[in-house]
């Protein structure tokens, strides 16, 4: 269940940084914003839950990475990839992408100028 830690390699690389952070609060935060009325998500009840819980932890995790456009984009792509299969239709995919692109701004980070969120072979 727990994270495989201590993978050696260049600790400054975006891949290593994205691998070290916990992106689940970001995923929950976005799902809460687009599915607030839905009963269950990922076995955690999001009814009447303040999104600020997830947002604070999400921003803390994103803050752990070097604040570069490339690393932020890789993190957003990873979030998109992790949640792709849970997004039920095209409209939900678009909503998720919109919220995802707003995430850096919500955390007071620079948003990546160009970040292709089309992942999973075009499914998302």
């Amino acid at each position: 269940m727990r994270r495989e830690r201590g993978r050696q390699g260049d600790s400054s690389s975006c891949e290593r940084q994205v691998d070290r952070v916990n992106l689940k609060p970001c995923e929950q935060h976005i799902m809460q914003r687009i599915m607030g009325e839905q009963e269950q998500y990922d076995s955690y009840d999001i009814r009447s839950t303040r999104s600020s819980d997830q947002q604070q932890r999400c921003c803390d995790e994103l803050n752990e990475m070097e604040n570069t456009q490339r690393c932020m984009c890789e993190a957003l792509q990873q979030i998109m990839e992790n949640q792709c299969d849970r997004l039920q239709d095209r409209q939900m995919v678009q909503q998720f992408k919109r919220e995802l692109m707003n995430l850096p701004q919500q955390c007071n980070f620079r948003a990546p100028q160009r970040c292709d969120l089309d992942v999973s072979g075009g499914r998302c």
């Epitope: 269940m1 727990r2 994270r3 495989e4 830690r5 201590g6 070290r20 916990n22 689940k24 609060p25 995923e27 929950q28 990922d42 076995s43 955690y44 009840d45 999001i46 009447s48 839950t49 303040r50 600020s52 819980d53 997830q54 604070q56 932890r57 803390d60 803050n63 752990e64």
Partner: antibody, heavy 123, light 108 residues
């Protein structure tokens, strides 16, 4: 063996200062957020402060804000708590605790704790 | 600040009985950020449950957690002698990461 060992506690007068240390071993220290939690004699647990892996995000309990400073040295596998302007109510056992998270579902938890170091503030 | 209120303050039961411990939050807490710890006299706290309902490593299945929003519960289905201790809930989603005041589970 995964271990946290606190040191630096002792008797200090009100208004005085103390620096607590926590030595980590048996795991990659720089991969974990760290916390200080205290427990006054006969009382419950009180979260004091937390610091993220790279020290970029730090939080404090309102009761210690402006008086205590948390820091870490990843090269030395050490966590610190600088305590200034100490008050009687800061008397407690201070625990250092490692914070991990479940990679598959995301929740955070403090899974490794030191045995604690005792701080007594008294004139 | 989110205030966590645990009840009862003290619970007196016998081995073999069922224990139900409550933790109520002053504001809604995602169950992703609700943790339970056990502490015995003279010892450091021990992680029991995280994400409200996931047992930590080596925690026996007589321990279970449930709840959402503002109401959370820790249940011990059949008390063993080693279960008598103080139990704390904690929320770690929003700083300050507050603890409840604890429930002391004592032998009747």
């Amino acid at each position: 063996e995964v271990q946290l060992v606190e040191s630096g506690g002792g008797l200090v007068q009100p208004g005085g200062s103390l620096r607590l240390s926590c030595a980590a071993s048996g795991f990659i220290f720089s991969d974990y957020n760290m916390n200080w939690v205290r427990q006054a004699p006969g009382k419950g647990l009180e979260w004091v402060s937390s610091i993220t892996r790279s020290s970029r995000t730090i939080y404090y309990a309102d009761s210690v804000k402006g008086r205590f400073t948390i820091s870490r040295d990843n090269a030395k596998n050490s966590l610190y708590l600088q305590m200034n302007s100490l008050r009687d109510e800061d008397t407690a056992v201070y625990y250092c605790a490692r914070e991990d998270f479940d990679v598959s579902t995301g929740p955070y938890y403090m899974d490794v704790w030191g045995k604690g170091t005792t701080v007594t503030v008294s004139s | 600040e989110i205030v966590l209120t645990q009840s009862p303050g003290t619970l007196s039961l016998s081995p073999g009985e069922r224990a139900t411990l409550s933790c109520r939050a002053s504001q809604s807490v995602s169950n992703m950020f609700l943790v339970w710890y056990q502490q015995k006299p003279g010892q450091a706290p021990r992680l029991l449950m995280y994400g409200a309902s996931t047992r930590a490593t080596d925690i026996p299945d007589r321990f279970s957690g449930s709840g959402s929003g503002t109401d959370f519960t820790l249940t011990i289905s059949r008390l063993e002698p080693e279960d008598f201790a103080v139990y704390y809930c904690q929320q770690n989603g929003n700083s300050p990461y507050t603890f409840g005041q604890g429930t002391k589970l004592e032998i009747k």
